[in-house]
């Protein structure tokens, strides 16, 4: 049996063809990059750049591709088998526990602390106490107590747990 050619295998100029590829379900499921027809007889390919499915499924529709928010950069585009990958812009981060938006990284550590970790798209700068080496997880000091590496940005709440 010949292999099913899915949308992600095609060159960009070939992807615009409106006809969606079809194949038969296997044990009632359709492969990644497809969804099942309403009558359950066919697997219909997702539309490149519009929707996707990542696993074997019995979805009646492929899932909508994510659009990156402002303040995010697109690391990789949506294909028929993988959603868009978005990442916070430089100087901002998104925590796993509060993932709704990218937050500005702090520009420096509170007085008496030293920076041991840089701002990354998934974490704020990391500060430790000079003497004890323990992470900062307490209240944010007043702005004038904050040692900054660039002027003008007040400290945001420190969210690193110790």
């Amino acid at each position: 049996e010949s292999a099913l050619i899915t949308q992600q295998d095609l060159a960009p100029q070939q992807r615009a063809a409106p006809q969606q590829k079809r194949s038969s379900p296997s044990e009632g499921l359709c492969p990644p990059g497809h969804h099942i027809s309403e009558d359950g007889r066919d697997c219909i390919s997702c539309k490149y750049g519009q929707d996707y499915s990542t696993h074997w499924n019995d979805l009646l529709f492929c899932l909508r591709c994510t659009r990156c928010d402002s303040g995010e950069v697109e690391l990789s585009p949506c294909t028929t088998t993988r959603n868009t990958v978005c990442q916070c812009e430089e100087g901002t981060f998104r925590e796993e526990d509060s993932p709704e938006m990218c937050r500005k990284c702090r520009t420096g550590c509170p007085r008496g602390m030293v920076k041991v970790g840089d701002c990354t798209p998934w974490s704020d700068i990391e500060c430790v106490h000079k003497e004890s080496g323990t992470k900062h997880s307490g209240e944010v000091p007043a702005v004038e107590e904050t040692v900054t590496s660039s002027p003008g940005t007040p400290a945001s709440p420190c969210s690193l747990s110790g």
């Epitope: 969804h35 696993h55 499924n57 979805l59 009646l60 909508r64 796993e96």
Partner: nanobody
Framework: EVQLLESGGGEVQPGGSLRLSCAAS????????VGWFRQAPGKEREFVSA????????YYAESVKGRFTISRDNAKNTLYLQMSSLRAEDTAVYYC???????????????????WGQGTLVTVKP
């Protein structure tokens, strides 16, 4: 507080069946996708299956395709996993999980889930 309580695990022979349940004590259960993961001894936690908030459509890992069926009863805040044709390699602790954020229609990676049950052990051996 989100609480997820799995049950239904046990020891079964190869080729046998089990039905796992997961009772959720959270009001948003009926509006959220929910998933099953498993962790075998010495291995990483892996995706098994996930189901849409409305129960219409689900994802399955290739390793369980055609053998496992996920379902849910939103009126009872309960998730199910019907497992049949069980194999030795299905031996693991099975966890149900709710995603940490609501913007993914059907999350399927460990990091997308923030709320986990304590797990129920499934052992498949002759």
């Amino acid at each position: 507080e989100v609480q997820l309580l799995e049950s239904g695990g046990g020891e079964v022979q190869p080729g046998g069946s089990l039905r796992l349940s997961c009772a959720a004590s959270v009001s948003t259960f009926g509006t959220s996708p929910v998933g099953w993961f498993r962790q075998a001894p010495g291995k990483e936690r892996e995706f098994v299956s996930a189901i849409r908030w409305d129960g219409v459509g689900a994802y399955y890992a290739e390793s369980v395709k055609g053998r496992f069926t996920i379902s849910r009863d939103n009126a009872k805040n309960t998730l199910y996993l019907q497992m049949s044709s069980l194999r030795a390699e299905d031996t693991a602790v099975y966890y149900c999980a709710l995603p940490r954020r609501g913007d993914s229609e059907l999350p399927s990676t460990v990091k997308e889930y923030g709320y986990w049950g304590q797990g129920t052990l499934v052992t498949v051996k002759p």
